[in-house]
Interface confidence: low
């Protein structure tokens, strides 16, 4: 089609080498069509996935995407040739920086219903440079927590190392929804709640003397508890003695809770006690089966091929650490009569 | 289908606390935010506040010091308490389920509500 | 907190009338709006949220446009069962707000 009536957009994306980032566009199709084609999904308001459901009819979305080629070539389906971009309805995520991201995008809408939907489209030209500032070394980061309850903020990093005389109007997204009164390059939180968690983007506009663009940021934020006073508690087992059958195989899972910590290293670890001697065993790896705001719990099994005389002397024991402490279990294994 | 039924006394003595429960039926009450709005007679909509299923609250700065929304998980209720009461507080109250719509944008809906209670202050 | 104004407060109107209801927020709300349809005796049913997109099940004879501080709700062939009190609501800042209604009446 003949994207020369599309309405056009520059934006800029300057990435830190030293951290991971993702970078989104944004469909931006002219009212009130835009309406019409990304059909809203119904969800609750804690149900966020990492990439929303596509929903309506066997159409992956309701737009299309396409990737302009420098050489000329025809448009390029975005879908077919990218693996890195995500589309998620009428937005585009770049999962991973890189100049080669550079380019020119365009989206329309996929039905064309009506013949001025022909020229409803958008063209969206990326540019796309690392991070060259060496004295910005405390940009605000890609990743920013705000600690539940208390008062906190979140920082637009691409405006973060700028001097107080360079200070632009920021226009900022919430999960591509546009937050009206937030003007600065710092939104402040009063109180910090759950739904305050998302994608933000943060925009501002740059010009020289030739043409204006875009400058945009993406921060996922993290709403947290506060980082646990506790050491990890062991929920499973709780005997100290266990029942077997002699030659059978047994498995024996230690299931402990850990408190949040937003630096977390678990250790949980199975090791056997005999006598005066005691060793790690090798175990399958430990996996996390619920995972809350304020908690997490992880299992980790042992797997005895059969139990034998000798494991009845034996001690099992359960390890669990954070940074806080450690606890442990044992359990005596005793023959089923 | 979810459905969502307001109960409690229908009249309140001025000074007394009002209390209403809302019982979810048809549906999990958690992962949503859970709304009163109050109808004077005759008159418009009021928004008193919200409770999450992990109790976070967010009430009305004209009502905050008289209002407390609490959440029972377990019994799949939540409730309302109007302290020091006076007439002007009689009203039809509803409960409602606050839903986020997603796009890649996010849009807040009040999507189900219960058919309202009447409550009247009078000795 | 952010004011709605709704005009007119009430209207008479035929069956088959075009009827077009506006909102006004003292302040931007950006698209955060919502418009709900509320009948003698029953609750509030959601039409239309985000301004302009229709709550499923809601007849195509209702749109909402409108973004920042004007809205609009339009019906555009009134039926028998649109007689009723309808409300803007915002949904940009706490506290949510309501607009006072709009109370459509049979001519």
């Known amino acids: 089609f003949n994207i020369s009536g599309c309405s056009t957009k520059k934006l800029l994306w300057t990435y830190s080498t030293r951290s991971e980032e993702e970078f989104v566009l944004f469909c931006d199709l002219p009212e009130p069509q835009k309406s019409h084609f990304c059909h809203r999904n119904r969800l609750s308001p804690k149900q966020v996935p990492e990439h929303l459901p596509f929903m309506g009819s066997n159409d992956l979305s309701d737009v299309q995407w396409y990737q302009q080629p420098s050489n000329g070539d025809p448009l390029e389906d975005i879908r077919k040739s990218y693996p890195h971009i995500i589309q998620d309805k009428c937005t585009l995520h770049f999962l991973t920086p890189g100049v080669n991201n550079s380019g020119s995008y365009i989206c329309r809408p996929k039905m064309i219903k009506s013949p001025y939907d022909v020229a409803c489209c958008v063209k969206m030209i990326l540019e796309v440079k690392p991070q060259t500032n060496a004295s910005c070394e405390y940009s605000a980061s890609h990743k920013q927590d705000l600690l539940l309850g208390s008062t906190g903020s979140i920082s637009c990093p691409s405006l973060s190392c700028q001097s107080d005389a360079q200070s632009p109007a920021v226009t900022w997204y919430k999960n591509g929804k546009l937050l009206s009164v937030e003007r600065s390059n710092r939104i402040v939180v009063d109180e910090v709640y759950d739904y305050h968690q998302g994608t933000y983007v943060c925009d501002y506009t740059q010009s020289d003397t030739v043409s204006s663009w875009t400058v945009r940021a993406v921060v996922q934020v993290r709403t947290i508890v506060g980082d646990t006073k506790l050491k990890p508690d062991i929920l499973d087992p709780v005997e100290d003695t266990l029942e077997v059958e002699l030659g059978k195989p047994l498995t024996i899972s230690c299931k402990a809770r850990f408190g949040f910590e937003r630096v977390f290293n678990p250790v949980i670890k199975w090791y056997i006690k005999d006598s005066d001697l005691e060793w790690e065993v090798s175990v399958p790896e430990a996996k996390s089966i619920k995972s809350t705001l304020k908690d997490e719990i992880i299992e980790r099994n042992i797997i005895l091929e059969k139990v034998t005389q000798r494991d009845l002397r034996r001690k099992f024991v359960c390890f669990v650490q954070n940074s806080i402490g450690n606890t442990t279990q044992s359990v005596q294994l005793k023959e089923k009569r | 289908q979810v459905q969502l039924q307001e109960s409690g006394p229908g009249l309140v003595k001025p000074s007394e606390t009002l209390s209403l429960t809302c019982t979810v039926s048809g549906g999990s009450i958690s992962n949503y935010y859970w709304t009163w709005i109050r109808q004077p007679p005759g008159k418009g909509l009021e928004w008193i506040g919200y409770i999450s299923d992990s109790g976070s609250t967010n009430y009305n700065p004209s009502l905050k010091s008289r209002v407390t929304i609490s959440v029972d998980t377990s019994k799949n209720q939540f409730s309302l308490k109007l302290s020091s009461v006076t007439a002007a507080d009689t009203a039809v109250y509803y409960c409602a389920r606050e839903t986020i719509v997603v796009r890649g944008f996010y849009f807040y809906v009040m999507d189900v509500w219960g058919q309202g209670t009447t409550v009247t202050v009078s000795s | 907190a952010i004011q709605l104004t709704q005009s007119p407060s009430s209207l008479s109107a035929s069956v088959g009338d075009r009827v077009t209801i506006t909102c006004r927020a003292s302040q931007g709300i950006s698209s955060a709006l919502a418009w709900y349809q509320q009948k003698p005796g029953k609750a509030p049913k959601l039409l239309i949220y985000d301004a302009s997109n229709w709550e499923s099940g809601v007849p195509s004879r209702f749109s909402g446009s409108g973004s920042g501080t004007d809205f609009t709700l339009t019906i555009s062939s009134l039926q028998p069962e649109d007689f009723a009190t309808y409300y803007c609501?915002?949904?940009?800042?706490?506290?949510?707000?309501f607009g006072q209604g709009t109370k459509v009446e049979i001519k």
């Open positions: 609501q915002q949904f940009n800042s706490y506290p949510w707000t």
